[in-house]
Amino acid sequence: EEELQMIQPEKLLLVTVGKTATLHCTVTSLLPVGPVLWFRGVGPGRELIYNQKEGHFPRVTTVSDLTKRNNMDFSIRISSITPADVGTYYCVKFRKGSPENVEFKSGPGTEMALGAKPS
């Protein structure tokens, strides 16, 4: 079976205040079974940005329909970008577990930074 890879193609994403940013993430395998979550940062302060299963994320939408069985695209859009949104974003695969899911593999991260203001 093919080993799962987490692909975040952009190392750097320049965004504009007030606009919508798209953070890309695709996986190369449907296995292991379990969700893909989005985080900002690493370590103790790692912040949950999107979890399809629980929570309220009013500014985040998915690019694809995550409920489709064969979906391998876990990209997200973040609307109404502000300077507080800068940082490095990671899509992270969890393996289904009991009682809790276990982190399996992280993408390499995409750094979101502010680009030039629109003229």
Epitope: L37, F39, G41, V42, P44, G45, R46, E47, G55, E100
Partner: antibody, heavy 117, light 108 residues
């Protein structure tokens, strides 16, 4: 407004146990890293433990195996279970919210833990 | 573990003076330094992060600078409410997160 309120401190004998609580409000608790930072009387700040927004846990070496950090997202509460307490654990224990790049943007007022016979 | 050394340990100054506090790291930390103010009987308060970014609500007289291993916190025209202990913290390496020993700014 972000608010962090610690409780559970007190006087305990060496070798004893104590559980600290930190109740949070004003932000989406489950999404963020939370931490405990302590300050011995008249001394500086020392990071103790943290629980990230993904539920991962982190400890400074001196408390590993003795302290356990946990959280109940449904109650917006962070805990620190402290076992095998030592005199050198005597300190004010602060609960702090951790930013995504690992500094502390909000702090509680602290709760005093005294380990003495 | 990254060790942070703050100097001086105590600084005696008069209101209105300009104050510069130093924090040195035992290795390069890519500008990942935060500064906190703590008054007696109170919790620390975030002043500066990423070496030079002011936290929300912090007055403009507080500024941070530095790179590599040496960082400074400057308070221009010290106010009476600025007498406190100031701590630096590195947020580069989180295993573990570490603080400096603090600098006490007291009234001359």
């Amino acid at each position: 407004d972000v608010q962090l309120v610690e409780s559970g401190g007190g006087l305990v004998q060496p070798g004893g146990s104590l559980r600290l609580s930190c109740t949070a409000s004003g932000f989406t608790f489950r999404n963020y890293g939370m931490s405990w930072v302590r300050q011995a009387p008249g001394e500086g700040l020392e990071w103790v433990s943290a629980s990230s927004g993904s539920g991962s846990t982190y400890y400074t070496d001196s408390v590993k195996g003795r302290f356990t950090i946990s959280r109940d997202n449904s109650k917006n509460t962070l805990y620190l279970q402290m076992n095998s307490l030592r005199a050198e654990d005597t300190a004010i224990y602060y609960c702090a919210k951790v930013t995504w790049n690992n500094f502390f943007d909000y702090w509680g007022l602290g709760t005093l833990v005294t380990v003495s016979s | 573990e990254i060790v942070l050394t703050q100097s001086p340990g105590t600084l005696s100054v008069s209101p209105g003076e300009r104050v510069t506090l130093t924090c040195r790291a035992s290795q390069g930390i890519a500008g990942k330094i935060a500064w906190y103010q703590q008054k007696p009987g109170q919790a620390p308060r975030l002043l500066i992060y990423d070496a030079s970014s002011r936290a929300t609500g912090i007055p403009g007289r507080f500024s941070g600078s530095g790179s590599g291993t040496e960082f400074t916190l400057t308070i221009t025209s010290l106010q009476s409410e600025d007498f406190a202990v100031y701590y630096c913290q590195q947020h580069y390496d989180w295993s573990p997160l570490t603080f400096g020993g603090g600098t006490k700014v007291e009234i001359k």
